[in-house]
């Protein structure tokens, strides 16, 4: 209560004592809560705007002789009595302000949730882009460098980082090649990027019979079925997410081939022209 004095238009005189001015103080809305003034410094006062509110009009408060000053020592000793009907106790826009604040908070929260809510990152394996083949005649080994294409779509309203891509190629349930790409790219909000990655593969040893097939040049197309596996790791807000895809693809092991995107998926295995 004492703190609110500094915001109230009341005055008191530094020489007012409790017993001498009680009725006047009470009438004017000031009560001395102490018997005497503990602060004896005369010049140490605080300046406040002053109005005495009687209910009808404003008059000079005799408690402080109209000086508009309350001695500093009495700041915490005087209590203001204000009529309940004082409009200043009831600001007209409080509800409006509260409602507006709540609405703004809800709006901001909703927008934050809408824009920051994690959405899916779509990974679409498009297919084999090219396959470059070489042979080791001595070892009866086939080396295939297979370049694949991925489409990665970011459905979020913020950028995501494609941290790494790990890929492996299987032939006849045997892993013949692996690759890993790190720190690849950053995909912007609602953006899509096409990423090419190459997997070096080796067909050898117990699969050396494939060498006979792939180097049999009386066949025009030496299609072999490979299983492409790819795992894309993306990060956003420190959160890591992995998306995997598997696809069977035809690859020509008999010659260097560049494919139209998606073409290698639908090729039929052609028969030799003998």
């Amino acid at each position: 209560m004492g703190k609110s004095l500094s915001h109230l238009p009341l005055h008191s005189s530094k020489e007012d004592a409790y017993d001498g001015v009680t009725s006047e103080n009470m009438r004017n809305g000031l009560v001395n809560s102490e018997v005497h003034n503990e602060d004896g410094r005369n010049g140490d006062v605080s300046q406040f705007p002053y109005v005495e509110f009687t209910g009808r009009d404003s008059v000079t408060c005799p408690t402080c002789q109209g000086t508009g000053r309350i001695p500093r020592g009495q700041e915490n000793q005087l209590v203001a009595l204000i009529p309940y009907s004082d409009q200043r106790l009831r600001p007209r826009r409080t509800k409006l302000y509260v409602m507006a604040s709540v609405f703004v908070c809800l709006l901001l929260s909703g927008l934050a949730v809408f824009f920051l809510f994690p959405r899916s990152i779509d990974v679409k394996y498009i297919g084999v882009k090219s396959a470059y083949v070489s042979y080791d005649v001595q070892k009866r080994t086939i080396y295939l460098n297979i370049t694949n294409t991925l489409n990665i779509t970011n459905n979020n309203y913020y950028s995501v980082e494609v941290e790494n891509i790990t890929a492996q190629v299987q032939f006849s349930k045997t892993v013949i090649g692996k690759a890993r790409l790190n720190n690849i790219t950053i995909i912007g909000p609602l953006d899509m990027k096409q990423i090419d990655y190459t997997v070096p593969t080796v067909i050898a040893e117990e699969m050396s019979y494939m060498y006979d097939f792939c180097t049999l040049i009386s066949i025009k197309v030496h299609n072999i079925v490979l299983m492409m596996q790819v795992t894309v790791t993306t990060t956003y807000f420190g959160h890591s997410e992995q998306i995997s895809q598997e696809r069977y693809q035809y690859v020509d092991c008999g010659r260097n081939t560049t494919y139209q995107l998606g073409q290698s998926e639908y090729l039929n295995v052609l028969q030799p022209q003998q």
Epitope: V133, S134, Y135, V137, Q138, R140, Y209, M210, Y211, D212, F213, C214, T215, L216, I217, S218, I219, I224, G254, R255, Q271, P272, Q274
Partner: antibody, heavy 119, light 112 residues
Framework: QVTLKESGPGIVQPSQTLSLTCSFS??????????VGWIRQPSGKGLEWLAK???????FYYPALKSRLTISKDTSKNQIFLKIANVDTADSATYYC???????????WGQGTTLTVSS | DIVMTQAAFSNPVTLGTSASISCRSS???????????LYWYLQKPGQSPQLLIS???SLASGVPDRFSSGGSGTDFTLRISRVEAEDVGVFYC?????????FGGGTKLELK
């Protein structure tokens, strides 16, 4: 271990149809890039391709003899058959069957069967 | 057809010395895939032919490394570094590049 063995009548009369059989073991003719071929060698002369059959049942015949040759296979029995129609004395030779492959050529050969065309 | 040409006889060689056998093709046997489709076979007296070398330079399994092969697209040489008595026979070159596959006439290795 890959083995091939040819069998035939030994002697046939001119204008008859000759049937030869190649029985093999140690490999499968269902494997990609594998096949079996027939080669013949007249006495004291060089080698001549006759026909070949591949894992996918595709067949090839030496162009000059194509009209007289028929090659077939029974994969379940691991056997290859060659028929030569309308034989004459020029067909007298040792007939070999060999396992063939695109990369390695005729890597394994049978011991051969000698055919004599005689009236 | 691709014609494979060989001399009927080699120069007589002494056991333990090296020997060379030549073969020529009527067309380059080097394919666009980098492989040369030339093969060497040895037929020992009274036996079936056996594969020595496939695709110009690859030694067949079980063949001693005394044998080696080289050449360009059309001219090829089979080398035997130390000739042994068991090497005697007829050496055939062959091509698998085009249909029909064809053999050379064969070169007989003769000893001095």
């Amino acid at each position: 271990q890959v083995t091939l063995k040819e069998s035939g009548p030994g002697i046939v009369q001119p204008s008859q149809t000759l049937s030869l059989t190649c029985s093999f073991s140690g490999f499968s003719l269902n494997t990609l890039g594998r096949g079996v071929g027939w080669i013949r060698q007249p006495s004291g002369k060089g080698l001549e391709w006759l026909a070949k059959i591949w894992w996918n049942d595709d067949k090839f015949y030496y162009p000059a003899l194509k009209s007289r040759l028929t090659i077939s296979k029974d994969t379940s029995k691991n056997q290859i058959f060659l028929k030569i129609a309308n034989v004459d004395t020029a067909d007298s030779a040792t007939y070999y069957c060999a396992r063939i492959a695109g990369g390695t050529g005729a890597a394994y050969w049978g011991q051969g069967t000698t055919l004599t065309v005689s009236s | 057809d691709i014609v494979m040409t060989q001399a009927a006889f080699s120069n007589p060689v002494t056991l333990g010395t090296s020997a060379s056998i030549s073969c020529r093709s009527s067309k380059s046997l080097l394919h666009s895939n980098g492989i040369t489709y030339l093969y060497w076979y040895l037929q020992k007296p009274g036996q079936s032919p056996q594969l020595l070398i496939s695709q110009m330079s690859s030694l067949a399994s079980g063949v001693p490394d005394r044998f080696s092969s080289g050449g360009s697209g059309t001219d090829f040489t089979l080398r035997i570094s130390r000739v042994e008595a068991e090497d005697v026979g007829v050496f055939y070159c062959a091509q698998n590049l085009e249909l029909p596959w064809t053999f050379g006439g064969g070169t007989k290795l003769e000893l001095k």
